[in-house]
Interface confidence: low
């Protein structure tokens, strides 16, 4: 990913000073990645290269929210995925029961202060068994396949960070249009594993983009948007970056 | 229920420092930036500037750099302000505030600088 | 920096009627305004937030509008309960600035 990093500073991609308003950070995901049907596989977004603190992370599938990990209020994951989408590792998301339907886009969220809103994308696409199985065979680690990927990748990043809307992170309004959007007619957040409602666990002491709200919604409020779904917590959410 | 709670009056001579304290409760501490605000007697708000609670790193605004600092007590859910080499113009009710929307406010602590 | 133009200064009006303060930014900024309260001896209170957001426990009379450089907060049946001094917030771009404040008065 250091090769990523330098591509994105290469390519011009705004790093202005903190204090300016401006956003410093790069997203760093997994890219195009491909899985077998019936099998599982984890979604991977890493913020770095920012001392902005995060939030809340959000997980949609193109238009559809799947999870969130907020920092005062842990993890939630939407009811339509609560048997096959698992939080973790991280803040990353474990998708489980693949199927071909699955092929997509995914999009990692992150709400930051006082930077505003990264969004990173990854593309999976769910193979047959026996085109995976195929597949596999044909994985021979060509220096020059992987300098292409690689590329694919980084443009891939920067595109996202670039296109990133400038608007700041974790609006109320925000929230509840996406919550209200995203799952309507959902009577309730029902959690894959009951626990307690949990702060968010600081899994590193980095100096960039740590557990934090240091701007968005309080917890008592964000009960308060998200009653309405009966919103419930999955437990703690880690929340960490490095610098880049 | 979320608070913010200051520290009380000051009154101070030109030259010397105060520190004024901030305290919060009722959600995690450093989740959540903290932002202070000045408001001189009669006067608006002016943003002073913000802490990173959890990395302790604050950003100052132009007109507060020098003089003032921020400065953190994690395990007490305590943000602090001090302020050094008081002049006359520091008067003024001096807010804690939290994150960017400024959701949550100290009631104010009131320095009056006076010879 | 973004300077936050906030008019008139002062207004007066009777109880029920209309209150509407003005906000100009000399630079864009989306969405990202913010509306407060401030009464007399109190820190100010969080009425709207960016995206023209009124707050869970503001009453609906209150209500903003506005995007890019120009936005409007207005009082709707305008109560007693009102008077205080009302500011603006830009929060696109920092330093923070604020609106000048208008202070609200009933005749």
């Known amino acids: 990913m250091r090769w990523c990093l330098l591509l994105i500073w290469a390519q011009g991609l705004r790093q202005a000073p903190l204090a300016s308003g401006m956003m410093t950070g790069t997203i760093e995901t997994t890219g195009n990645i491909s899985a077998e049907k019936g099998g599982s596989i984890i979604l991977q977004c890493h913020l770095s290269s920012t001392t902005a603190q995060v939030t809340q992370v959000n997980w949609e599938q193109q238009d559809q929210l799947l999870a969130i990990c907020n920092a005062d209020l842990g993890w939630h994951i939407s009811p339509s995925f609560k048997d096959r989408v698992a939080p973790g590792p991280g803040l990353g998301l474990t998708l489980q029961s693949l199927t071909v339907n699955d092929t997509g886009e995914y999009f990692c969220i992150y709400h930051t202060y006082p930077d505003g809103t990264y969004t990173g994308r990854i593309f999976l696409e769910v193979l047959e068994s026996s085109v995976a199985e195929h597949g596999a065979r044909f994985q021979i680690p060509l220096l020059g396949a992987m300098a292409a990927t690689l590329v694919v990748i980084c443009t891939a990043v920067i595109v996202v960070v670039a296109l990133t809307r400038k608007k700041k992170a974790l609006r109320i309004h925000s929230v509840e249009g996406d919550l209200r959007r995203k799952s309507a007619g959902q009577e309730e957040w029902s959690p894959s594993a009951p626990s307690p409602p949990g702060s968010c666990v600081q899994a590193e002491a980095a100096p960039a983009g740590l557990c934090g709200e240091q701007r968005g919604e309080d917890c008592a409020e964000l009960h308060d948007y998200f009653n309405v779904l009966s919103y419930r917590s999955l437990g703690n959410c880690s929340f960490f970056t490095e610098t880049g | 229920q979320i608070q913010l709670v200051q520290s009380g009056p000051e009154l101070k001579k030109p030259g010397e420092t105060v520190k004024i304290s901030c305290k919060a409760s009722?959600?995690?501490?450093?989740?959540?930036?903290m932002n202070w605000v000045k408001q001189a007697p009669g006067k608006g708000l002016k943003w002073m500037g913000w802490?990173?609670?959890?990395?302790?790193?604050?950003t100052y605004a132009d007109d507060f750099k020098g003089r003032f600092a921020f400065s953190l007590e994690t395990s007490a859910s305590t943000a602090y302000l001090q302020i050094n080499n008081l002049k006359n113009e520091d008067t003024a009710t001096y807010f804690c505030?939290?994150?960017?929307?400024?959701?949550?406010w100290g009631q104010g602590t009131t320095l009056t600088v006076s010879s | 920096e973004t300077t936050v133009t906030q008019s008139p200064a002062s207004l007066s009006v009777a109880t029920g009627e209309k209150v509407t303060i003005r906000c100009i930014t000399s630079?864009?900024?989306?969405?990202?305004m913010n509306w407060y309260q401030q009464k007399p001896g109190e820190p100010p209170k969080l009425l709207i937030s960016?995206?023209?957001t009124l707050r869970p426990g503001v009453p609906s009379r209150f209500s903003s509008s506005g995007y890019g450089t120009d936005f409007v907060f207005t009082i709707e049946n305008t109560l007693s309960e009102d008077v205080a001094d009302y500011y603006c917030l830009q929060s696109d771009n920092m330093p923070y600035t604020f609106g000048g404040g208008t202070k609200l008065e009933i005749k």
């Open positions: 009722g959600y995690t501490f450093t989740n959540y930036g």
């Open positions: 505030a939290r994150y960017e929307y400024f959701d949550y």
């Open positions: 960016e995206g023209n």
């Open positions: 630079t864009d900024i989306d969405d990202d």
């Open positions: 802490i990173n609670t959890y990395t302790g790193e604050p």
